[in-house]
């Protein structure tokens, strides 16, 4: 008998190594597991990162290493440890032949072990003429605060820390790990080796053309004069950064990884630890005109990935390649033809291109506004980027079309006050990783440790989904998105907001089997319906129009299909409000929309009814999406028939806590 | 080629275990949702378990918080483990691929599973 | 959980007749019903998915209807190789996936 699916076994492993960049992995934590680069080309076999369980001390890290130095010796082996971690992850660095793997793997608290790579800047061409320094009349670019309090760690090319704009604002450190330039007639340039980093620091806090002209700034040198660097040497300057912040505390610090390489679990891991310890890491989405999630840092969900849009609003293009986009994309900034310092001299400027160049508009923002609100966690300063970000002004049709509805449509913009914002209810749309094709195949959406899950959607482009809920998982509420069989798999929506002292629940209602529908609601006192979810085990609903969608008198209730169990997301926080707003069409349509007024945060956004030739439901910005299979392809105009249902929220206490502020 | 091998059967005492494994070859088990199916000599065909493609676990009501399922994407294999067996337990299990747009496309031969004392 | 029940549980036929094999589902199933042939000591073959494809390498003769709750297998033209038992299955409201009793083709 043939394979009959012998394709769709290419497409997953192909998938799967580019996504999780994983060789052969045991799955129950019995068994360490080895890791590398998707990428060939920048592979860097016979250097390892042999990471270990996340509660070994250093002592043991050192005992493992020289455990294996002395296991492989006995085979006959050489091995050098290059480093030992500690401060950020324990494990160590070591320059071994590969052969060695199986033993390095077997020893005790190895977590995983990953093969050394390649990471590279993102900023395309290095030098194009010089121009000279744009002057600034009073009235133009003068921001309230320059983020003078804020300390903005550069980890990039050496730098000019000479030149006119940057003088006395960038501190250069001693930190360096970087390696040999690539071919033998290289000659090292200092001109060219502190392009990339020069023209960065400029950018952020500039004196002439910098965002937050008040930031200072650490630069540690992690790529060499051709812009190139590896995993290992950028973690190295992650355990580097976290060292001095342990033993000098200071006011927030930004970390600018303006470098991007394949998918990297540990580099990953790495960022997500420094994120945890409170510091705010912004990253280049990579210029690789590919999906985002296949590069790191720029997959890591802790790090805030900037993408490149021109003065147009377009995405950026980089000769044949360009900006990257998709899901692992926070938002976009300015990336093309970006006017910063020169390393050619200590007045010249040059114009840049890149989503390094976008991320650095984006570390400087961040650093104004934790200059005017030290106390903001990393949570609170992503949804505040993202509110204040332009909104639907990039066009799309320059992206992928399987990546359009995951790609965040903002351009990052400075807050028109950098106070006065905390009245506002913050919320953010999170997508899973597609969960593939297999009956049983789920995705999950998980929102930051700071963000209350308010609800949960899903979507398919194929229309074949058993719905959506949220679960508990470790303590957490996850979004959780069930394929159905024969479809091409889903995606679980999450919708991730900031609603201090709240305590939200999850009541479930089983399928009602009657031909009213099931209906759940908030019972508990105080608490408000924020978002509403359904999920069915049959592989194909029925069509089912509910009689009545919403009796009156009733908001904090969810309704859908009979077959289905139907969650409902309920909340308590103080001052908290909520109102259902639905939008429905009696013709089949491929898209209705429903959006939350001014003053109103859309926190759910559901689709009525449940059948299957609706695609799903999606909260973009604060408008609620729900999609349904092409028009001509749908039946009946009844079974065409859809409403949007949003559930949009808002803060009295926020508010009042803000005025008092005021 | 795509084989399912079993193994792991035998005889065994009503209250014991055994863990039966299933051995993919031709693909890559872990990519596809697996399943263990069996039949009590001259009976039907019953479902047991199965595992996700997503690491998701499923079981029929009379084998559930005994049987666990589980796999090992390094040896491509999955596995059933058996505790606190019944004489009703007694069949042939057969281990089963779903495929993406077939169910079950690929078969164990099937290992048989004795519980008496 | 759905109940499948198929009817006869044993069908004699002559070669080269045509046989006709009933499954029923307590509740609607959509056409989400396999057919699956299992001689004595082997492993169960699919036959028919969807309740009316043809898996890959079945022959011609082999054909599946219906939707809803009423479903047939019918083979053509019976040949030796054919004497079996036959399952159907419904896979559209899980866990668990059930199993029709089968039905029994054998030599008049």
């Known amino acids: 008998q043939e394979d009959e699916d012998g394709d769709y076994e290419e497409l997953v492993l192909a998938l799967r190594s580019e996504e999780d960049g994983l060789a052969e992995a045991p799955e129950h934590g019995t068994t360490a597991t080895f890791h590398r680069c998707a990428k060939d080309p920048w592979r860097l076999p016979g250097t390892y990162v042999v990471v270990l369980k996340e509660e070994t001390h250093l002592s043991q890290s050192e005992r493992t290493a020289r455990r294996l130095q002395a296991q492989a010796a006995r085979r006959g082996y050489l091995t050098k440890i290059l480093h030992v971690f500690h401060g950020l992850l324990p494990g160590f660095l070591v320059k071994m032949s590969g052969d060695l793997l199986e033993l390095a793997l077997k020893l005790p608290h190895v977590d995983y072990i990953e093969e050394d790579s390649s990471v590279f800047a993102q900023s395309i061409p290095w030098n194009l003429e010089r121009i000279t320094p744009p002057r600034y009349r009073a009235d133009e670019y003068q921001p309230p605060d320059g983020g003078s309090l804020v300390e903005v760690y550069l980890l990039d090319t050496s730098i000019q820390s000479d030149h006119r704009e940057i003088e006395g604002r960038v501190m250069v450190t001693d930190f360096e790990n970087v390696p040999e330039e690539d071919g033998t007639r290289f000659h090292r340039q200092a001109s060219k080796c502190d392009s990339h980093g020069t023209h960065l620091a400029g950018v952020v806090s500039g004196r002439d053309a910098g965002v937050a002209k008040g930031a200072s700034m650490r630069s540690l040198r992690v790529l060499n004069c051709q812009g190139k660097g590896t995993v290992s040497g950028t973690l190295i300057g992650l355990e580097f950064i976290r060292k001095s912040q342990l033993v000098q505390p200071v006011g927030p610090l930004v970390v600018l990884l303006p470098l991007a390489g394949g998918y990297s679990r540990v580099l990953n891991a790495a960022c997500q630890r420094l994120a945890r310890a409170g510091v705010v890491l912004v990253t280049a989405a990579g210029n690789f005109r590919d999906d985002a999630c296949l590069y790191s840092p720029a997959s890591a969900p802790e790090v805030i990935t900037v993408g490149a849009t021109n003065a147009q609003d377009q995405p950026v293009t980089l000769g044949t390649l360009g900006t990257n986009f998709g899901r692992c994309v926070d938002l976009f900034a300015p990336g093309e033809d970006i006017i910063g310092a020169s390393s050619d001299c200590s007045t010249c400027f040059v114009s840049q291109s890149g989503t390094s160049q976008a991320a650095a508009h984006v570390a400087g923002i961040a650093a104004m506004m934790l200059s005017a609100e030290p106390e903001l966690t990393l949570a609170e300063l992503r949804q505040r980027l993202i509110h204040f970000s332009a909104k639907d002004v990039i066009n799309e049709a320059w992206f992928p079309e399987d990546q359009r509805v995951l790609t965040p449509n903002l351009v990052a913009a400075l807050p028109p006050s950098t106070h006065g914002a905390g009245w506002q209810l913050f919320c953010r749309t999170v997508w899973s990783a597609h969960s593939g094709p297999t009956r049983m195949a789920t995705a999950v959406a998980r929102c930051a440790p700071d963000e209350e899950l308010l609800s949960c959607s899903s979507f398919s482009r194929s229309g074949k989904r058993r719905g959506e809920r949220m679960e508990a998982q470790g303590g957490k509420l996850v979004c959780r998105a069930h394929n159905a069989f024969g479809g091409e798999g889903v995606y679980a929506i999450a919708r991730c907001c900031l609603l201090p002292q709240a305590n939200c629940s999850v009541h479930t209602a089983p399928p009602a089997e009657a031909s009213m529908g099931t209906r759940v609601h908030c019972h508990q006192q105080g608490h408000v319906l924020t978002g509403c979810s359904s999920h069915w085990e049959v592989e194909d609903l029925g069509t089912h129009k509910p009689p009545v969608l919403r009796p009156r008198g009733q908001p904090n209730q969810c309704v859908g299909h009979r077959e289905a169990s139907i969650h409902a997301s309920c909340c308590h926080a103080p001052g908290l409000e909520c109102k259902v707003k639905e939008h429905g069409i009696p013709a089949p349509q491929e898209q209705v929309t429903v959006a939350c007024e001014e003053g109103w945060t859309l926190t759910g956004c559901s689709a009525l009814p449940g059948t299957s030739h609706v695609l799903g439901a999606y909260a973009v910005d604060n408008t609620c999406v729900v999609r349904s299979r092409d028009v001509s392809t749908t039946g009946s105009t009844s079974e065409g028939a859809v409403t949007a249902v949003a559930i949009c929220c808002r803060s009295r206490h926020l508010a009042q806590a803000s005025q008092e502020l005021q | 080629e795509v084989q399912l091998v079993e193994s792991g059967g035998g005889l065994v005492q009503p209250g014991g275990s055994l863990r039966l494994s299933c051995a993919a070859s031709?693909?890559?088990?872990?990519?596809?949702?697996m399943h263990w199916v069996r039949q009590a000599t001259g009976k039907g065909l019953e479902w047991v378990s199965a595992i996700g493609s997503t690491g998701d676990t499923y079981y029929t009501g009379s084998v559930m918080g005994r049987f666990t399922i589980s796999r090992d994407a390094a040896k491509n294999s999955f596995y059933l483990e058996m505790n606190s067996l019944r004489v009703g337990d007694t069949a042939v299990y057969y281990c089963?691929?779903?495929?993406?747009?077939?169910?079950?496309?690929?078969w164990g031969q099937g290992t048989l599973v004795t519980v008496s004392s | 959980e759905i109940v499948m029940t198929q009817s006869p549980a044993t069908l004699s036929v002559s070669p080269g007749e045509r046989a006709t094999l009933s499954c029923r589902a307590s509740?609607?199933?959509?056409?989400?019903v396999a057919w699956y042939q299992q001689k004595p000591g082997q492993a169960p073959r699919l036959l028919i998915y969807g309740a009316s494809t043809r898996a890959t390498g079945i022959p011609a003769r082999f054909s599946g209807s219906g939707s809803g709750t009423e479903f047939t297998l019918t083979i053509s033209s019976l040949q030796s190789e054919d004497f079996a038992v036959y399952y159907c299955q419904q896979y559209n409201n899980w866990p668990p996936f059930t199993f029709g009793p089968g039905t029994k083709v054998d030599i008049k």
């Open positions: 031709g693909f890559t088990l872990s990519s596809y949702d």
């Open positions: 509740q609607s199933v959509s056409s989400n």
């Open positions: 089963a691929r779903e495929g993406i747009r077939t169910p079950y496309d690929y």
